[in-house]
Interface confidence: low
């Protein structure tokens, strides 16, 4: 190698200056007794190199690029060799921004997978490889007193969420949780959440069912539907409240909400609907009276209300 580049920093803030030095060893001087060192950023020649012969006979050129406005570029030093440039050395330069503070950190406790799933917004593009780490610790108080730390959770590349498995959680005990973003230009940390994983439990929705008609049961009245559901129960008992929504399948009607509903309903009659109309129904539940998150809406159940009975039959019902 005849030449060697060293730079003030290979990674800088976008728009910041960068200084580079290219040294040509003395044993390469046969190329030219006073070789003129040229600089190139990408494909463009860069003026402004200051060249000097050092006491040991080596040649040095120093250049300052006042603003590195490329997020990635190769800086090379070269000599004129005949009619072409002879590259002596090159370095990759990167420019970008330190990570912004991650924001909107929120967490859900998924009792199906027994894991605490946290997500956040990473902030604007840094143009540099930026790693995110979900950090947490156990606490018996309001997270001002710290207990054992929990192993860092590192999301897969490009993801802004991470799952802390059950084995690292103590349910019914507070945890301090925050996200740390890091790249070559700095580190930032989100505001800390303090939460009991069970207080952010997200339940699975119940399963809605149509009631099997039985010979002894009265048929539903006109404009009514008969249905049933069972609450989802994980391994531990969780009190919950539920709500139902429904809308006609046809037309532009919006959802109508009914609730709170009884926790379990082996038989529930929903009335006040349009007769002879197909309806879509869904149900969801939340831990209650303790804190939690609403479950997703259940898969839809599609049912049709009975037709309005003829007037004399209707009259007959009331006698």
């Amino acid at each position: 190698e005849c030449g060697h580049i060293s730079v003030s920093a290979p990674i800088v803030h976008l728009g910041d200056p960068i200084t580079a030095s290219c040294i040509i060893k003395q044993n390469c001087s046969h190329l030219d007794p006073e070789p003129q060192i040229l600089w190139r950023l990408g494909a463009e020649l860069q003026p402004g190199g200051r060249q000097q012969r050092l006491s040991d006979g080596t040649q040095e050129s120093i250049i300052t690029l006042p603003h590195l406005n490329h997020t990635q570029a190769f800086l090379s030093c070269a000599l004129n060799w005949g009619n072409s440039l002879q590259i002596l050395d090159q370095v990759e330069l990167r420019a970008g921004y330190p990570p912004a503070i991650p924001h909107n950190l929120s967490c859900l406790m998924n009792l199906t997978t027994s894991s605490l799933i946290c997500q956040w917004e990473p902030g604007p593009e840094t143009h540099l490889p930026t790693s995110f780490t979900l950090k947490s610790f156990k606490s018996r108080g309001n997270c001002q007193t710290q207990g054992d730390s929990i192993l860092d959770c590192v999301p897969k590349d490009g993801q802004s969420h991470c799952s802390i498995p059950r084995k690292h959680l103590l349910l019914y005990q507070n945890m301090g949780i925050w996200v740390q973003a890091e790249n070559a230009l700095g580190t930032s940390m989100s505001p800390q959440l303090c939460l009991d994983p069970m207080d952010v439990v997200k339940l699975e929705p119940p399963m809605l069912r149509t009631m099997d008609p039985s010979p002894e049961a009265a048929p539903p009245q006109a404009g009514c539907l008969q249905l049933s559901w069972e609450p989802w129960q994980p391994g531990l008992h969780i009190n919950q409240k539920c709500e139902l929504r429904h809308k006609p399948q046809r037309g532009e009607a919006s959802w109508a909400l009914v609730g709170p509903l009884p926790l379990e309903a082996l038989q529930y009659e929903l009335c006040g609907l349009l007769p002879a109309t197909a309806y879509t129904l869904q149900i969801r539940c939340i831990r209650w009276p303790l804190p939690g998150h609403w479950s997703d809406w259940s898969p839809s159940l599609e049912l049709r209300t009975t037709e309005r009975a003829p007037t004399h039959h209707h009259h007959h019902h009331h006698h």
Partner: antibody
């Protein structure tokens, strides 16, 4: 009770090497960041280096970069600082410390004196 | 790296005095600021973490405040055992630099 015990300090000539050790007990060592902080005689505290729980992240102060290496052995609950190319200005008491989850130096050892002199 | 500047570098006070020490960061560090006490010949001791949180076992006469770049350690009523040197330290970045220290001496 958290305990941190440094060893390996002593007198060394400029250009020489030394390896400091810190034996930790009283907490789950493998879950915590650890660090080294030094204090030259009559001077203030100077952060030297720290290391993540797994050992994958190892930042250094500019003054020691390229000369010092921090490492840990989680199976032995021990933190190390390998110091090469020592200079007179590296003379200091070197403290081993356990970091809390917000980067605070929660617990400190009593320190070990490193003297670099010819 | 973020640099930490403490002031004053030393102060003289009497038992019972209210003492305030300030620490300034060269750029915003949110609340990631910690305070330590060190007595001669002893290892430092954590007093306050995350700007205002009292470490277990630290007397309540010590308090911390501030956010961003400017932080304060206050000793509400100085006790004989509080004569020591106090340091701030930022933990916003991995390069966790300390302030230069404030020596609290007996007047």
């Amino acid at each position: 009770e958290v305990q941190l015990l440094e060893s390996g300090g002593g007198l060394v000539q400029p250009g020489g090497s030394l390896r400091l050790s810190c034996a930790a007990s009283g907490f789950t060592f493998s879950l915590y960041w650890m660090g080294w902080v030094r204090q030259a005689p009559g001077k203030g505290l100077e952060w030297v280096s720290s290391i993540s729980s797994s050992g994958g992240v190892t930042p250094y102060a500019d003054s020691v970069k390229g000369r010092f290496t921090i490492s840990r052995d989680n199976s032995k609950n021990t933190l190390y600082l390998q110091m090469n190319s020592l200079r007179a200005e590296d003379t200091a008491v070197y403290y081993c410390a356990k970091l809390g989850e917000l980067g605070q130096y929660q617990f400190w050892g009593q320190g070990t004196l490193v003297t670099v002199s010819s | 790296d973020i640099q930490m500047t403490q002031s004053p570098s030393s102060l003289s006070a009497s038992v019972g005095d209210r003492v305030t020490i300030t620490c300034r960061a060269s750029q915003g560090i949110s609340s990631y600021l910690n305070w330590y006490q060190q007595k001669p010949g002893k290892a430092p001791k954590l007093l306050i973490y995350y700007a205002s949180n009292l470490q277990n076992g630290v007397p309540s006469r010590f308090s911390g405040s501030g956010s961003g770049t400017d932080f304060t350690l206050t000793i509400s009523s100085l006790q004989p055992e509080d004569f020591a040197t106090y340091y701030c330290q930022q933990s916003f970045q991995y390069a966790q630099h300390f302030g230069g220290g404030t020596k609290v001496e007996i007047k």
